[in-house]
Interface confidence: low
């Protein structure tokens, strides 16, 4: 059977969802007036950078858009960005596309995404509404790094 990405609604413990604003992702409160993105997730077939303790290596994309999450250094700081890329193009590559890879780890009923390119840096939402989704190395009260993934048919 041909591989296909799994689709998820994603939210954090404060009921913030991910919203596409232009070509960037922001966190916004779950409400009828907001259209949250559906996250596409597919496992990487290449095991070059695998680390089972950190989780499964996955590519993350936005359903219905040729946009994928990737990590790059800007002014010396790891930064989360969206790049025009079809998630299946990443999947079919024999060699793992490191900037686009994340370790997906389960913590209880939540999911955590750690950059493969920048170990110790996690996808996070701010506790303030309307802020971009970003990478942080400080997990805790001021940043939400644990997400609920609700499967979408």
């Amino acid at each position: 059977r041909e591989a296909a990405p799994k689709s998820y609604a994603i939210r954090d413990s404060r009921q913030m969802v991910w919203v596409l604003s232009g070509n960037s992702l922001i966190a916004a409160p779950l409400s009828r007036s907001i259209k949250p993105v559906t996250l596409h997730l597919i496992a990487c077939r290449d095991t070059e950078f695998s680390d089972k303790e950190k989780g499964n290596m996955v590519y993350l994309g936005i359903k219905g858009k040729d946009l994928c999450l990737f990590c790059a250094e800007i002014q010396g700081k790891p930064t989360l960005q969206l790049k025009e890329k079809n998630i299946m193009d990443l999947y079919v590559e024999k060699k793992a596309q490191k900037p686009f890879l994340f370790f997906h780890n389960k913590e209880g009923s939540t999911s955590v995404f750690q950059s493969v390119s920048y170990p110790g840096w996690f996808i996070a939402t701010s506790t303030t509404s309307g802020q971009p989704i970003f990478l942080t190395k400080e997990r805790g009260i001021t940043n939400n790094t644990n997400f609920y993934l609700d499967s979408v048919e």
Partner: antibody, heavy 122, light 111 residues
């Protein structure tokens, strides 16, 4: 039609643990896109949300009660329960269980139990 | 003290229109969280009256309507009837508290 029924002791001694169960009929507690909650109302006062558990098993608690509250689901009995530890007279209230739907956003608690009065007294 | 502020009481004569306000802040209503309204008749459990700011569940008369603007929400009742005499509560989500919050409730008296 979904129906909820609270059950548990009507009298609890101070410092003990209040335990209530909500039995769900007319639907499955494991159904996708539902969340289940507990709300209380002290005599003559307003409503206070205690906490909720959603269809993923994720729990959410009122920050002022968090250290004392546990909400859990028993799928085999189609029930969810509330445990509130170290109770005082201030926990005397009518306790309601309620449910609502989640579809991109929360749609309010649209089904409620009839409520059960719990008195904390020695 | 409730996170959402409602007037303790409102009143109106049969046939009149009354409104009940619910004032929040930038961490709940003002942060685009939905507002829900409940009606609690004496001695009974609350009943969902309005969900998602302005939507009526089936069976709720169109005399009841909800609206939201900025950090506040309102419930309007037109053609007031004796059976509308009840307590009314607004509810939203507050991200600074990571949970649901209710207003203190408003007692509606039909004169």
């Amino acid at each position: 039609e979904l129906q909820l029924q609270e059950s548990g002791p009507g009298l609890v001694k101070p410092s003990e643990t209040l335990s209530l169960t909500c039995t769900v009929s007319g639907g499955s507690i494991t159904a996708s896109n539902y969340y289940w909650g507990w709300i209380r109302q002290p005599p003559g006062k307003g409503l206070e949300w205690i906490g909720s558990i959603d269809y993923t098993g994720s729990t959410y608690y009122n920050t002022s009660l968090k250290s004392r509250v546990t909400i859990s689901v028993d799928t085999s009995k189609n029930q969810f329960s509330l445990k509130l530890s170290s109770v005082t007279a201030a926990d005397t209230a009518v306790y309601y269980c309620a449910t609502g739907k989640y579809y991109e956003t929360y749609l309010g608690f649209d089904v409620w139990g009839q409520g059960t009065l719990v008195t904390v007294s020695s | 003290e409730s996170v959402l502020t409602q007037p303790p009481s409102v009143s109106g004569a049969p046939g009149q229109r009354v409104t009940i306000s619910c004032t929040g802040s930038s961490s709940n209503i003002g942060a685009h969280y939905d507002v829900h309204w409940y009606q609690q008749l004496p001695g009974t459990a609350p009943k969902l009256l309005i969900y998602g700011n302005d939507n009526r569940p089936s069976g709720v008369p169109d005399r009841f309507s909800g609206s939201k603007s900025g950090t506040s929400a309102s419930l309007a009742i037109t053609g007031l009837q004796a059976e509308d005499e009840a307590d009314y509560y607004c509810q939203s989500y507050d991200y600074s508290l990571s949970g649901y919050v209710f207003g203190g409730g408003t007692k509606l008296t039909v004169l």
